[in-house]
Amino acid sequence: TASKAWTLEVLYAPRRLRVSMSPGDQVMEGKSATLTCESDANPPVSHYTWFDWNNQSLPYHSQKLRLEPVKVQHSGAYWCQGTNSVGKGRSPLSTLTVYYSPETIGRR
């Protein structure tokens, strides 16, 4: 008798979320910094929310948060939340550190 092959698709809320930073987590002022919310989810994340370490939501809702030019005032810890049709998940905190260039320090 012929047997049928079945595929079981498991849906789950976003998990293993993390914030990655490019070019790194320590960036000189005036350069650009990109924070990316990475996750494992099925179905894929449909909505992203970004938060600072005071748990204030930020006005960014895409997977990537681009800061250009980056300022010392952007220094801090960030986390992201991903949402799909199953539920939500959140990342741990990741810290972005912005430091003054030698030229800026020399002018002060």
Epitope: E29, W53, N54, Q73, G76, Y100, I105
Partner: nanobody
Amino acid sequence: QVQLVESGGGLVQAGGSLSVSCTASESTFSIMMGWFRQAPGKQREMVAVINSAGSTNYADSAEGRFTISRDLAKKTVSLQMNSLKPEDTAVYYCYVDGYFGQGTQVTVSS
């Protein structure tokens, strides 16, 4: 220009405790303060940071062993390090609102 003066550090045996402190010459402390470290041949990495509201974030390696604190009035940020391990050996740098200090050596012997 903000001057950061670091103190503390030194040589300690594994399992021991040590504290490092940093004082800023001007009244900043409005964005983020913290401690970073750089071991020989490695990149500088974040150890612990704190903001003016008192929110903190620790590296996984520091969680549960190190405690960061700040005194806004005295313009100081301190790091209490307990249960030190040889892999904690590094130059520890203070960070305050965009400025890094010159660093202070912490050596943990086995």
